[in-house]
Amino acid sequence: VLEVYYTSLRCRCVQESSVFIPRRFIDRIQILPRGNGCPRKEIIVWKKNKSIVCVDPQAEWIQRMMEVLRKRSSSTLPVPVFKRKIP
């Protein structure tokens, strides 16, 4: 599940990882766009083991995965869910 959040919070990520995470370990992916107190885009992966990982938006694997999810969302497959929460 892919989620896009617009929040008024400052940056959430202190440390970012670039290591590939297999889909079966991922619960959902949260995207925090640049702005609203944070000068950079943030990607937060919520894992099925209940832990959270901040992923470097420049990491090749996450860019590739996002592209796959975008392609699926533009087709008839109802896999990703895009949520926009405006405070």
Epitope: S18, V19, F20, P22, R23, R24, K48, E60, W61, R64
Partner: antibody, heavy 120, light 107 residues
């Protein structure tokens, strides 16, 4: 020090059954995915099955899922592989491995293996 | 299933040589590839994860690269203790699959 110790291997006749065990120490066993991987004599590595910490997600190699069952007992820090209707081609060294889901996501710790021989 | 085609199946090289092993996935596996070293009679050891990250304690002469379907494992300067069989593995999706292995020998 992390240790994974397999046991339960041995000689079994075709059609027979065997239950392998893997005892874990030095890790918080209940937190990690675990896998079984086998290696036939002189051959490469073949993944058998994996199980998540809660035993709620289990995946098998398609060719083995009807005969093999992976399970775990977190209270005993143990992983198991029940093998039924064994065939000669199941002869192999069977390894248990920790599949890290916190940092590496690959199999970072392996046992020394236990040998299964299926022969009449 | 995703097939991992590893080549060469064996190779002979001299101490100090640069050694390269390739692995080709039958479909996109993103960067979900690991490389393992196995010495005779021993369990495999993780060397590289996420296609290009060295595992803890692995010497810097070992490296990996690639994404999608094409992956490379390199030993920059072969040492006598590197004699072993090397395997690639995709952990992008189940069933997890390994390459056929590359047996490395010293000339």
């Amino acid at each position: 020090e992390v240790q994974l110790v397999e046991s339960g291997g041995g000689l079994v006749q075709p059609g027979g059954s065997l239950r392998l065990s893997c005892a874990a120490s030095g890790i918080d066993f209940s937190r990690y995915w675990m896998s079984w991987v086998r290696q036939a004599p002189g051959k490469g590595l073949e993944w058998v099955a994996e199980i998540n910490p809660e035993s709620s997600t289990i995946n098998y190699a398609p060719s083995l899922k009807d005969r093999f069952t992976i399970s775990r007992d977190n209270a005993k820090n143990s992983l198991y592989l029940q093998m039924n209707s064994l065939r000669a081609e199941d002869t192999a060294v069977y390894y248990c491995a920790r599949q890290d889901d916190t940092r590496y996501y690959a199999m970072d710790y392996w046992g020394q293996g236990t040998t299964v021989t299926v022969s009449s | 299933d995703i097939q991992m085609t590893q080549s060469p199946s064996s190779l002979s090289a001299s101490v100090g040589d640069r050694v390269t092993i390739t692995c080709k996935a039958s479909q996109d596996v993103n960067t979900g590839v690991a490389w393992y070293q196995q010495k005779p009679g021993k369990a495999p050891k993780l060397l590289i994860y996420s296609a290009s990250y060295r595992y803890t304690g692995v010497p810097s002469r070992f490296s990996g690269s690639g994404s999608g379907t094409d992956f490379t494992f390199t030993i920059s300067s072969l040492q006598p203790e590197d004699i072993a069989t090397y395997y690639c593995q995709q952990y992008y999706s189940t069933p997890l699959t390994f390459g056929g292995g590359t047996k490395l020998e010293i000339k």
